[in-house]
């Protein structure tokens, strides 16, 4: 995925005196923080596994990419990263595996040239729906945001809200139309049992959409019809049974398009004719010789694209006088 | 039902090469993947790849490639190993198998020892 | 490439016995994991697939359980003809790995 990454070496690290005696004026234009390593000439600064509990407000205002990961930073509240003067060059924020549980409204706030953000690894049970808008109305200033990367960021099960947490991420993506240019979405290993129909309609410049490794059972009411730059679908290790001849249309009909697929619980009965003679004429799924029945049983581990008609066959529905009790 | 019959040992010379056998009954033959696997003393069992009969699409273990090579006979039903190059490291059973996301059917194995 | 561990190496057991097995993977495979027999004459069987299948014609007395890296094989009554080697094998990511095997012995 796509994480803030560094040219740097020659990282300068302060000594935590020296941090602490300017904590309370601006930073100065070389200074680095506590428990953080920084290179100027790389524009970065990695405060890694530190176990900070809050975000380093002595940031030098050159960072350009800020690693926060692996610390213990809980809550983002609003402003976290609002500096005078602003951080204006931060364009990539890593804050991955930093236990935080709740991002709060305006959490991203004042960083105009925000690029990259990854939240992965942590375990959101509060995402305010203003989190990357800002504000709470219907239309927002754009998000300078390009790439969102939020894989396995579902909190353990007794940690969630009362509410759908697919429609909590939902809601913080679409609030106030800000993330509009976002090209790249990653929602891998979140538990998504289903895609909220509204949410693809909303983000119109996706190039990239990864939605692996979750729980999803069908795409029926997931309409892919506006995503006409899209390049990569992930949609490898969910619980898919089949894909109907709507969804398959609608892919076919992207110009771009590359879908993965590979590990989903194939049913291999009458429903799956159409999406195995699509399999066999289309070009737009990568390994498609590796996709294999799961069921049935009598079924299981036959490659679909080697199955034909007489194979997908589905058990006659018995009237209610022939049925066995 | 089900079975996969593999050639005999073999006992071959450093530097040879040989082409190793699994005939498959009892099932759709292209329609299902077809593995190879190695299984040497005190190394436990080793995917060498698969090969698609139908199609002929191959996956193979980095580690063996340019080593093993897979081809496959759609009228007579069997699928071949071909190695190259061998030396003392070849030396294992190796067995044939019907794939996919599991190995549910298995031949016998073939028993190749390479000895000057 | 995924590395397949299976701590326990080889293991003694009495008739009767519930032999539990372990493999654990190198990262996160969603279930998708196998075992197998490998019998003295070395026949190979498969006997449970997608972590806890049971493949048909294997007595129910084997089960498997686990999520995300750790995993477990479980002959709940040992058998004579259970004496074997296990072996766990991950098919989440090509190429599909084996654990070491773990040698089941009669006491």
């Known amino acids: 995925s796509s994480s803030p990454t560094s040219s740097a070496s020659s990282f300068s690290s302060s000594a935590p005196f020296l941090a602490s005696a300017v904590s309370a004026q601006p930073p100065l234009p070389d200074q680095c923080p506590a428990l953080c390593e920084c290179s100027e000439a790389a524009r970065t600064v990695k405060c890694v596994n530190r176990n900070l509990t809050e975000v380093p407000t002595d940031l030098p205002a050159y960072v350009r990419n800020l690693f926060l990961t692996g610390n213990q930073l809980a809550v983002l509240p609003a402003g976290a990263f609002a500096r005078r003067p602003p951080l204006a060059e931060l364009a990539a924020l890593n804050l991955s595996g930093s236990r935080l549980d709740e991002v709060r409204a305006g959490a991203f706030e004042h960083l105009p040239s925000l690029r990259q953000l990854d939240l992965s690894h942590n375990p959101l049970a509060d995402l305010s729906p203003f989190a990357f808008s800002g504000s709470n109305a219907s239309v927002s200033a754009p998000s300078p945001l390009v790439e969102l990367i939020l894989n396995h960021i579902v909190p353990p099960e007794d940690e969630r809200q009362n509410r759908s947490f697919e429609g909590m991420v939902v809601a913080a993506l679409l609030a106030g139309r800000a993330l509009q240019g976002l090209r790249r979405l990653e929602l891998a290993s979140n538990h998504f049992l289903y895609l909220p129909r509204d949410v693809l309609a909303q983000l119109p410049s996706l190039r990239h959409l990864d939605l692996s490794n979750n729980s999803l059972v069908s795409l029926t009411y997931v309409s892919f019809r506006n995503l006409t730059h899209l390049e990569s679908l992930h949609l490898e290790d969910n619980a898919l049974k089949v894909l109907h001849n709507g969804t398959l249309a609608e892919l076919q009909g992207l110009p771009h398009i590359r879908v993965f697929l590979d590990n989903n619980p194939w049913v291999c009965d009458c429903h799956m004719a159409d999406m195995v003679t699509w399999l066999k004429e289309t070009e737009v799924v990568q390994g498609k010789d590796r996709l294999t029945c799961a069921y049935p049983e009598k079924m299981r581990n036959r490659v679909l694209l080697e199955l034909n008609s007489a194979d997908l066959d589905c058990d006659p529905i018995l009237p209610p006088s022939l049925q066995t009790s | 039902q089900v079975q996969l019959q593999q050639s005999g040992a073999e006992l071959m010379k450093p530097g040879a090469s040989m082409r190793l056998s699994c005939k498959a009954t009892?099932?759709?033959?292209?329609?299902?993947?077809l593995e190879w696997i190695k299984r040497r003393p005190g190394h436990g069992l080793e995917w060498i790849g698969e090969i698609l009969p139908g199609r002929g699409s191959t996956n193979y273990n980095e580690k063996f490639k340019g080593k093993a090579t897979f081809t496959a006979e759609t009228s007579s039903n069997t699928a071949y190993m071909q190695l190259t190059s061998l030396t003392t490291e070849d030396s294992a059973i190796y067995y044939c198998?019907?794939?996919?996301?599991?190995?549910?059917?298995w031949g016998q194995g073939t028993t190749l020892t390479v000895s000057s | 490439d995924i590395q397949m561990t299976q701590s326990t190496s080889s293991l003694s057991a009495s008739l009767g016995d519930r032999v539990t097995i372990s493999c654990s993977a190198s990262q996160g495979i969603n279930n998708h994991l196998n075992w197998y027999q490998q019998k003295p004459d070395g026949t190979v069987k498969l006997l449970i697939y997608?972590?806890?299948s049971l493949h048909s014609g294997v007595p129910s007395r084997f089960s498997g359980s686990g999520s995300g890296t750790d995993y477990s094989l479980t002959i709940s009554n040992l058998e004579p003809e259970d004496i074997a080697i296990y072996y766990c094998q991950q098919f989440s990511k090509l190429p599909y790995t084996f654990g070491g095997g773990t040698k089941v012995e009669m006491k």
């Open positions: 009892g099932y759709t033959f292209t329609g299902y993947w």
């Open positions: 997608y972590t806890s």
């Open positions: 198998a019907r794939g996919g996301r599991d190995f549910d059917n």
